[in-house]
């Protein structure tokens, strides 16, 4: 989800303030405010419904929240792409849609939002624990990857309320950069700014809201679709494996659709920082598809409980992957 | 780099099958689909289907779903096409294509002939 | 099954002339989500596997040289070669990328004259 810290406003600075001093307080704080306020962690959502009329047909919605272009959409069941799922389809916003049994129909919706309905009969048919994963490649924030499956409970034609975060993969190597410098211009910001208060010039005016409390957002499917990303493809992955995840979590929404927003709450800066980011809602687990261990061609460590990193299958030049691959 | 390695021309009798090879390297292999093109000599392009190593389901065009059969071998990163049933219209130049079509292979001549 | 018709089936042109050539598709190629054209244009030279030239009907693939344009929209599109060049003589080939079966156009062939 994308978090939005309220910075207070800053005053220019009283007569007599000059020099190296001046120039600091003035330019590199206002550089890593707008880079503070503007930059927003991307999130993916993912809506699954079983169909009345048909049990085994199946409807998936994802959308990417992000101000990035995107560039591939890749669906699959069964698991995250490329850790076991099955691919269902593959979306380029310019190239086309391809799609593979038992996904019958994948289209855009939106220039950020796909559909994908499914129908089987049979071995390859979706069931009612499958866990359907939505991939989207964009740039420059990586790929994100959000899964989600309908709760055993749910009666045909209705779908599971918003879960908690689901599966979050982030691609480090296209935005590790980028992440490590915000966070600590932030922190450096925040350190700044502390600073000021205790100094008679330039006074800091108290903002309405708490510099540090990120405000969340809840994005519902309709207002997701309003926004105007670049989506260039998408990935199902289903099956009917044991679902990976716990949607048995309301947190209110639409009645119609299980929706599954990812909630980025957090811009690791390296693998290691992973280890102490707080683990998400029970039945859910993060984890961090790395370019770089790719790369390297290393497996990146365990983290933690809850905590896996998968490397990138997809090598180098994975941002042409299925992602813009024609 | 990438390419697509396919075998220049294989001859067969009327009847028999055939085992098409297209063999990847230069870039990661679960991560694309294969496409086959048929082309008869000084005709036209035609799609047969294609096929995505994480999904064991091609997809195939109607004129040729008794004629062709997709697989993969993600262990080699190869993809096969065979072809059934041979007969003289099945003589033409066999490509695989990666992904959206950026990279081809040079092509397959098969030739049905008693 | 979406059809794809290509006209002229060939052209006669001079080095350093601007080309035009037509595709028709039987059916709209605009994907209405996203107002994005599914319309790819292969080149093809002789003994040789096609060459993606043009995708989402107007975007260059990488490499491909700026004389070529693609554009168009729904079913009507076309491919101009700005200034013709002797190493673009080959046939040319739109193909619908919108829905299964792709399809491929009857093609053009840019002769010399």
């Known amino acids: 989800m994308r978090t939005e810290a309220q910075v207070p406003a800053l005053q220019p600075p009283e007569p007599g303030l000059e020099g190296a001093m001046g120039h600091r307080t003035l330019v590199l704080p206002w550089v890593l405010l707008t880079l503070c306020v503007t930059a927003g962690t991307p999130e993916v959502w993912v809506q699954v419904r079983m169909e009345a009329t048909e049990l085994s047909s199946f409807t998936i919605r994802c959308g990417f929240l992000g101000s990035g272009s995107i560039s591939l959409v890749t669906v699959s069941w069964g698991g995250p792409n490329g850790a076991g799922g099955t691919t269902l389809a593959v979306l380029h916003p310019e190239r086309g849609i391809r799609q593979w049994a038992p996904a019958r129909q994948a289209r855009w919706e939106t220039q950020s939002s796909i559909s994908l309905i499914l129908e089987g009969s049979g071995a390859s048919s979706p069931c009612a624990n499958t866990t359907f994963c939505c991939k989207f490649a964009s740039f420059p924030e990586g790929s994100w990857e959000a899964c989600g499956s309908l709760p055993p409970s749910s009666d045909p034609g209705l779908s599971a309320p918003p879960t908690p975060a689901p599966i979050l993969r982030a691609d480090l190597a296209g935005i590790l950069g980028v992440s490590g410098v915000l966070l600590f211009g932030c922190v450096y910001l925040l350190h700044l700014l502390r600073r000021h208060k205790h100094r008679p010039a330039p006074r800091l005016q108290p903002s309405r809201t708490s510099p540090q409390a990120p405000r969340a957002r809840a994005w519902a499917p309709s207002q997701a679709s309003q926004a105007a990303l670049h989506v260039p493809y998408a990935t199902i992955n289903t099956s009917c494996r044991p679902a990976t995840l716990d949607t048995a979590h309301p947190h209110g929404g639409p009645s119609w659709w299980a929706s599954l927003p990812t909630h980025a709450a957090h811009r690791p800066q390296g693998p290691a920082a992973w280890a102490s980011t707080p683990i998400p809602a029970r039945g859910s687990f993060v984890s961090v598809e790395n370019g770089l261990y790719a790369q390297a061609g290393e497996r990146p460590p365990h983290t933690g409980p809850g905590l896996t990193l998968f490397p990138d299958p997809r090598g180098p030049r994975a941002m042409e992957g299925p992602l813009g691959v024609r | 780099q990438v390419q697509l390695q396919q075998p220049g021309a294989e001859l067969v009798k009327p009847g028999a099958s055939v085992n098409m090879s297209c063999k990847a390297s230069g870039y990661t292999f679960s991560s694309y689909w294969i496409t086959w093109v048929k082309q008869r000599p000084g005709q036209g392009l035609e799609w047969i289907g294609d096929?995505?190593?994480?999904?064991?389901?091609?997809n195939y065009n109607e004129k040729f779903r008794t004629k062709a059969t997709l697989t993969v071998d993600t262990s080699s990163s190869t993809a096969y096409m065979q072809l059934s049933s041979l007969t003289s219209e099945d003589s033409a130049v066999y490509y695989c294509?990666?992904?959206?079509?950026?990279?081809w292979g040079q092509g397959t001549t098969l030739t049905v002939s008693s | 099954d979406i059809v794809m018709t290509q006209s002229p089936s060939s052209l006669s042109v001079a080095a350093g002339e601007k080309v035009t050539m037509s595709c028709k598709s039987s059916?709209?190629?605009?994907?209405?989500?996203?107002?994005?054209?599914?319309l790819a244009w292969y080149q093809q030279k002789p003994g040789q596997p096609p060459k993606l030239l043009i995708y989402g009907a107007s975007t260059r693939e990488s490499g491909v040289p700026d004389r070529f344009t693609g554009s168009g929209s729904g079913t009507d599109f076309t491919l101009t070669i700005s200034s013709v060049q002797a190493e673009d003589l080959a046939v040319y080939y739109c193909q619908n990328d919108h829905g299964y079966p792709l399809t491929f156009g009857t093609g053009t062939k840019l002769e010399l004259k």
């Open positions: 059916q709209s190629l605009l994907n209405s989500g996203n107002q994005k054209n599914y």
């Open positions: 096929i995505h190593p994480g999904n064991t389901s091609p």
């Open positions: 294509a990666r992904g959206w079509g950026d990279y």
